[in-house]
């Protein structure tokens, strides 16, 4: 199993969570593995048990404290290790000096709601969750709208190049069911990636008034 291709990837949610995925071709599903975090300037260590998510990959979340507590800063380095049990001892399978603010992936936006809906327009707002105050306004968003008869993958991406937690969708069809999603990304971090997409928000445009088009 050691010779199979392996990969260890972690992201920091900017507050109190480091999420990690360990993949290794040919590894046994029942292998017991964990991630150990050892910061360079903190008194705590943290461990999480890797649980299978697919045939050859495992995931876990290092919970560093209360969800909105700022547990790490831009100067922190966290040495991460994957340890797998082999008989009576633990074997190190991967190691990384992890710079949290170079490897960011925020939580998906929450609290999506329709602020106002018309026949051709819909104003939607959302909130960001567990995002560090360090970012100030240095965030960007992507949004997409699911139209009838299409897939999410076909939906064009709308880019908001600033911290704007609302959008006005236009040129919609009256009396039509839509779904909307949004995701967020800090501008900081060489290996930073987009958050997961938010839960979809379903909404329906208003029907056109009889005899006229508003």
């Amino acid at each position: 199993a050691v010779n199979g291709t392996s990969q260890f990837t972690c992201f920091y949610n900017s507050r109190a969570n480091i999420s990690c995925v360990w993949s290794q071709d040919g590894a046994l599903q029942d292998t017991s593995c964990q991630v150990h975090a050892w910061p360079d300037r903190r008194r705590w260590n943290q461990t999480c048990e890797l649980l299978p998510v697919s045939q050859a990959s495992w995931a876990c979340n290092l919970i560093l404290g209360a969800p909105d507590s700022q547990k790490l800063t831009t100067v922190d380095i966290v040495t991460l290790r994957v340890l797998c049990r082999e008989g009576v001892r633990w074997r190190v399978m991967a190691i990384q000096d992890f710079k949290p603010f170079e490897n960011l992936r925020l939580m998906a936006p929450i609290s999506l709601q329709v602020v106002h809906v018309e026949t051709h327009r819909c104003n939607i707002s959302w909130e960001i969750s567990q995002a560090s105050h360090y970012f100030e306004r240095h965030l960007e968003f992507e949004a997409r709208t699911l139209s009838p008869g299409h897939t999410w993958e076909e939906a064009p991406l709308l880019t908001l190049k600033q911290k704007q937690e609302w959008i006005c969708l236009e040129t919609l069809t009256p009396d039509t069911q839509y779904e909307f999603q949004v995701r967020v990304k800090p501008l900081q971090g060489e290996f930073t990636t987009w958050s997961p997409w938010s839960q979809p928000l379903a909404f329906r445009t208003k029907p056109a008034a009889l005899g006229k088009d508003t």
Epitope: M93, I95, D97
Partner: nanobody
């Protein structure tokens, strides 16, 4: 582009010691995890040791644990492999490798982007 050059190999008697060096040029490796691999005649290349860029994290193959020690000197852009209590089965070409930028050091070759040409280590009985 990163160039890695190993040195320090040679012929040594069983029980002896060698210190391999891996010097990098073309880009600083001060934030890159590094690994050592080896390939014996007629065998596949195998993992030996790895070290994180700060030097805080290390890992070893079971066959060398307690005998080999990996270290680094980022100011010199160099990684070392101190090999003690050498055995004839340690005879191989030793390769230094740089992990993918921003990625963990792992035990598989696929996790490494840049490789040196290797240095021969021969342990006689």
């Amino acid at each position: 582009e990163v160039q890695l050059v190993e040195s320090g190999g040679g012929l040594v008697q069983a029980g002896g010691s060698l210190r391999l060096s891996c010097a990098a040029s073309g880009r600083s490796l001060s934030t890159t995890e590094m690994g050592w691999f080896r390939q014996a005649p007629g065998k596949e290349r195998e993992f030996v040791a790895a070290i994180t860029w700060s030097g805080r994290g290390t890992m070893y193959a079971e066959s060398v644990e307690g005998r080999f020690a990996v270290s680094r000197e980022n100011a010199k852009n160099t990684v070392y492999l101190q090999m003690n209590s050498l055995k004839p089965e340690d005879t191989a070409i030793y390769y230094c490798a740089a992990a993918r930028r921003g990625r963990a050091a792992v035990r598989s070759e696929g996790g490494y982007d840049f490789w040196g040409q290797g240095t021969q280590v021969t342990v006689s009985s």
